[in-house]
Each structure stands twice: as structure tokens, then as C-alpha cells.
Interface confidence: medium
């Protein structure tokens, strides 16, 4: 079935089409089984199909691929690897795919590949080389710019037998290919910590998401080198303070925009500073709304309108006189 | 009894056609990946190529790409292996194997019994 | 391609012996890997998979191990049937087989 001429409009194949050799050029109008396409937005949908594999048949022409809504459960090595190469592929979308497996070299061959959406799928294990393709200790510079990875933590009972924040961290940092990415989104994903060395190695990051997660500390973390930051999002955690040092690295970023609604943000001696550091800066988007959760007594008070009167410390007593 | 049938090797001369087929029974051969795996004289084990089961996904081995053709028939429970230009290289046994679901993410654990390719002039 | 070696290629044993068989991948491919038996003029049989997991109707004397890119198959106690050419697999990247391994009789 030939791609229609409007960019709005798809055509579709017919199921189990047969498919072309993946040695040759794909045939002009094909369109893979249970897809739709359309030359003339560049487009290819495979949205909903319970596919179970990435075709080898896409059109030449692709720029924007979805494959949402699928079963496609691991994403081998060069699963778009194709020759010629699918040389215009930029957004790939595999959200919501059942992925739990991405190997080393998935997305191999796509020398265009700008943005990743692996959104919604529990993924048990991903390869340190699912980015960079290669074990080299520095590998080709990947051209991805976008790379977004939001709820991809797999169930409790699925997980390796290792650390889910160092399996992400190895694949974003292998082989430093990744130096280009510019927004990178790992929201949702339980996090308790960010390894030390993640944001250091990640120079042209314009735009980082850590929401919805499980952070309690930002302590070992450093923001110093992300000079292009734009906007960081740290809303949903379980942040308790933020310290002087995180402080002045945030202030020092000349882009910054920083987001910290819904934190358990604890309201005594140790908050001094950054109440003080809230109502002089200008980074802090909706800084009204931040609230203490603890001390009791502290609780819904907004941390703008805290004097340093409110935010003393329960006298630490001597091991003589503490209780069980 | 789940079984694969291979059929349609013989003599053929280089530069020569041939097309195999391997008739499927026994499971749902709608549902499964199938492969070709060669075994030349004497030697080892060759994975050839490899169809999902829609068609919609196939990989060949850099020997035979451009060369050899791989297809199926879900309605018929076959599966195809169009072999052209055929050279004395690839004289072998031809096994039909089935796969798993998606990619290559199980073993070949059903095998039919070979049909023999033999490329001479 | 990741690339499969088994080794020794051939080995001599007897009835009862304990055998082993290695098996090499030119980089990691996690478990997936399996063994294969092969008898002159017949077509390989499935004997493990996932490295270490059993097919079903193969006898309990075959063992499979390790994971990564060293990989073992063991015959705890050789019968009169098991002489044969024994193959490895791995199925991470598209299918690639060992040169193969052939037991027979000391």
C-alpha cells in the first residue's frame, strides 16, 4: 500500500505482508505488517500490534518511529541495525513495550538517533554497552540528544541481584559516548541515590528529571560541571535538606531552574541555611509552596515565612541519660 | 507429535536455483520464529537465516544475504528457503529449526531430519 | 559476531567416565546459551538451554553451567549412547554454534 501524500494521514499494510530481504533497500511504499506509515511525515507507527520484534522491514525513509504498546520483551544487539542503515531515524519511542531486557549494541547503526523515549518498561537488565554499543573505554560519541528513561524500574521480585541505580548509571556512562546528551528523564524509577559520578560525565545536560523518586540526600552529588543546566527536577522525593554545598553549586549554574515540590523537607537546625539560601535566591521555581512534613510540630508550615527561632534541635543527651 | 519435514534439496550446478520447504505439525506454527541451519560435509553446525512469525522480521548470515530468500506460509504451516547463485560453498544439509517467540531468545529445540544441497558442476 | 569456542575437539573416554566439555564466547552473552547432541546422519537434539536448564526427556547425567563467556557441559557418568558430537550455542546475537566437541570411545 503506497504512503499517502498527506502528512496526517497513514497507510497501512496488510497483515503478515511478506517482507523484503534485510540485505536490500527496502521497497519504496512498503510499510511493515500491523504498522502504519506515512512518507510524507517520515513517520511509522506500530502502536498497540502485541508485537513481539522491531521489523527488519521499516522503510528507509523513517524519521520518527513508534512502537508503543507492545511485547517486544528484549531488544537484541543491532535490532535496527539494517542495510543500507536506517540513516534518517531520529525520535525512537518503545515506550509501554514490555522491554525487560536491552542488550549491548540495541541501537547500533542509527547514526541519526537523536531522542529514546524507553519510558514504562521493567527493565531487569540493561546492558552498560545498551548506549555506547561497544566495551571500549571510549567509545564513538553517540549522537543521542534526548534520552528518557522514566518508570523503568523493574518489579521488586524481577530485579537482578545488584544495585538498579548503578545498572542505569553503567549504561549512561560506558564508554563516555553519551557526553552529547542534552535532557536526560529518569523519573519514577525508586531511586535512593544518585552515584557520585553520574552528573560529572554528563557536560551538555540541559535538562535532568530525577522526580518521583526515593532520593533522601543529595550530599555526594555534584552539580559544579553542569554548567548548561537549564532546569532540575527533584519534586516527589524524599529530600530532607539540602546542604550548603548543594546550595552554592545550584546558585553558581547561570540557567538554573530548580524544582523541589513535595519533599519531606524537616524543619529543624539543619534547615537554617537553606531557608535563608530560599528567600534570597531565584532558582527555586515555586519556592512559596514548599512545606516541613517534620518535626510534628513543624508540619505544613511554609519554609519561607521560618526564622531561625523555629528551627532549633532537640538537645542531643548524654548515653547516661538516653532510653531505649 | 511435533515434527518438521524438509523437502526439495538435490544436485544443482554453481551460479544454479533451488527451493527448499519444510512443512510444520504438531504446534501452533503461527506463533513460533523458524530458521535454516546448514551443516556442510563433515564439518560444524551453520545458522543460515531466520523469519518471526509474521514475516515481518528476518535476518540471514552475511554468506548468503542477497542470495538466499527466506518466507512462510502460516496458512500452509511452511516455511521456505529460496536459494539462488547458488556455489560449491554451500553444499550442505539443511535443517529446518524452529525458534521462540520473538527474536533469538530461546534454543533451535525442534529439528527436522536435513534435505541435502549439493552445488557441483 | 561474537564467536564460540569449544573445547578439547575431540575426547576420548569410556563408559562411566565423568566428562566434561568447555565452551568459550568471544564476549558476554549472559546465560543464553545451549548444548546440543548430534549423532552421525541425524539432526542435533536440544539437551540444554539458558546455560544450565534441562529439556525435557533428556536423562539427569547432563549438566550444563556457568554464565558470562565460560560455559561447561558435563556427562556425570557416560553411557554407550552418549558418544557423539556434542555442539555449544549461543543465542544473545542472532545464532552462532562451537566448532563442536566429538566423545568417543577410548
Known amino acids: 500500500s503506497s504512503p499517502t501524500s498527506s502528512a496526517s494521514s497513514f497507510s497501512s499494510s496488510a497483515p503478515f505482508l511478506a517482507s523484503a530481504v534485510s540485505a536490500q533497500p527496502p521497497l519504496p511504499d512498503q510499510c511493515p505488517a500491523l504498522c502504519e506509515c506515512s512518507e510524507a511525515a517520515r513517520t511509522v507507527k506500530c502502536v498497540n500490534r502485541n508485537l513481539t520484534e522491531v521489523p527488519t522491514d521499516l522503510p528507509a525513509y523513517v524519521r520518527n518511529l513508534f512502537l508503543t504498546g507492545n511485547q517486544l520483551a528484549v531488544l537484541p544487539a543491532g535490532a535496527f541495525a539494517r542495510r543500507p542503515p536506517l540513516a534518517e531515524l531520529a525520535a525512537l519511542n518503545l515506550s509501554g513495550s514490555r522491554l525487560d531486557e536491552v542488550r549491548a549494541g540495541a541501537f547500533e547503526h542509527l547514526p541519526s538517533l537523536r531522542q529514546l523515549d524507553l519510558s514504562h518498561n521493567p527493565l531487569a537488565d540493561l546492558s552498560p554497552f545498551a548506549f555506547s554499543g561497544s566495551n571500549a573505554s571510549v567509545s564513538a560519541p553517540s549522537p543521542l540528544v534526548e534520552l528518557i528513561l522514566n518508570h523503568i524500574v523493574p518489579p521488586e521480585d524481577e530485579r537482578q541481584n545488584r544495585s538498579f541505580e548503578g545498572m542505569v548509571v553503567a549504561a549512561l556512562l560506558a564508554g563516555r559516548a553519551l557526553q552529547g546528551l542534552r535532557r536526560l528523564e529518569l523519573a519514577s524509577n525508586h531511586f535512593l541515590y544518585l552515584p557520585r559520578d553520574v552528573l560529572a560525565q554528563l557536560p551538555s545536560l540541559r535538562h535532568l528529571d530525577l522526580s518521583n523518586n526515593s532520593l533522601v540526600s543529595l550530599t555526594y552529588v555534584s552539580f559544579r560541571n553542569l554548567t548548561h543546566l537549564e532546569s532540575l527536577h527533584l519534586e516527589d522525593n524524599a529530600l530532607k535538606v539540602l546542604h550548603n554545598g548543594t546550595l552554592a553549586e545550584l546558585q553558581g549554574l547561570p540557567h538554573i531552574r530548580v524544582f523541589l515540590d513535595n519533599n519531606p523537607w524537616v524543619c529543624d537546625c539543619h534547615m537554617a541555611d537553606m531557608v535563608t539560601w530560599l528567600k534570597e535566591t531565584e532558582v527555586v521555581q515555586g519556592k512559596d509552596r514548599l512545606t516541613c512534613a517534620y518535626p510534628e510540630k513543624m508540619r505544613n508550615r511554609v519554609l519561607l515565612e521560618l526564622n531561625s527561632a523555629d528551627l532549633d534541635c532537640d538537645p542531643i543527651l548524654p548515653p547516661s541519660l538516653q532510653t531505649s | 507429535e511435533v515434527q518438521l519435514v524438509e523437502s526439495g534439496g538435490g544436485l544443482v550446478q554453481p551460479g544454479g536455483s533451488l527451493r527448499l520447504s519444510c512443512a510444520a505439525s504438531?504446534?501452533?506454527?503461527?506463533?513460533?520464529?523458524m530458521n535454516w541451519v546448514r551443516q556442510a560435509p563433515g564439518r560444524g553446525l551453520e545458522w543460515v537465516s531466520y523469519?518471526?512469525?509474521?514475516?515481518?522480521?528476518?535476518y540471514y548470515v552475511d554468506s548468503v544475504k542477497g542470495r538466499f530468500t527466506i518466507s512462510r506460509d502460516n496458512a500452509k504451516n511452511s516455511l521456505y528457503l529460496q536459494m539462488n547463485t547458488l556455489r560449491d560453498e554451500d553444499t550442505a544439509v539443511y535443517y529446518c529449526?524452529?525458534?521462540?517467540?520473538?527474536?533469538?531468545?530461546?534454543?533451535?529445540?525442534?529439528w527436522g531430519k536435513g534435505t541435502t544441497v549439493t552445488v557441483s558442476s | 559476531d561474537i564467536q564460540m569456542t569449544q573445547s578439547p575437539s575431540t575426547l576420548s573416554a569410556s563408559v562411566g567416565d565423568r566428562v566434561t566439555i568447555t565452551c568459550r564466547a568471544s564476549?558476554?552473552?549472559?546465560?543464553?546459551l545451549a548444548w546440543y547432541q548430534q549423532k552421525p546422519g541425524k539432526a542435533p537434539k536440544l539437551l540444554i538451554y539458558?546455560?544450565?536448564s534441562l529439556e525435557s526427556g533428556v536423562p539427569s547425567r547432563f549438566s550444563g553451567s556457568g554464565s558470562g563467556t565460560q560455559f561447561t557441559l558435563t556427562i556425570s557418568s557416560l553411557q554407550p549412547d552418549d558418544f557423539a558430537t556434542y555442539y555449544c550455542?549461543?543465542?544473545?546475537?542472532?545464532?552462532?554454534f562451537g566448532q563442536g566437541t566429538k566423545v568417543e570411545i577410548k
Open positions: 550455542q549461543q543465542y544473545y546475537s542472532y545464532y552462532t
Open positions: 529449526a524452529r525458534g521462540g517467540v520473538r527474536y533469538f531468545d530461546h534454543p533451535l529445540d525442534v
Open positions: 523469519i518471526g512469525f509474521s514475516s515481518s522480521t528476518i
Open positions: 564476549q558476554s552473552i549472559s546465560s543464553w
Open positions: 539458558k546455560a544450565s
Open positions: 504438531g504446534f501452533t506454527f503461527s506463533s513460533r520464529s
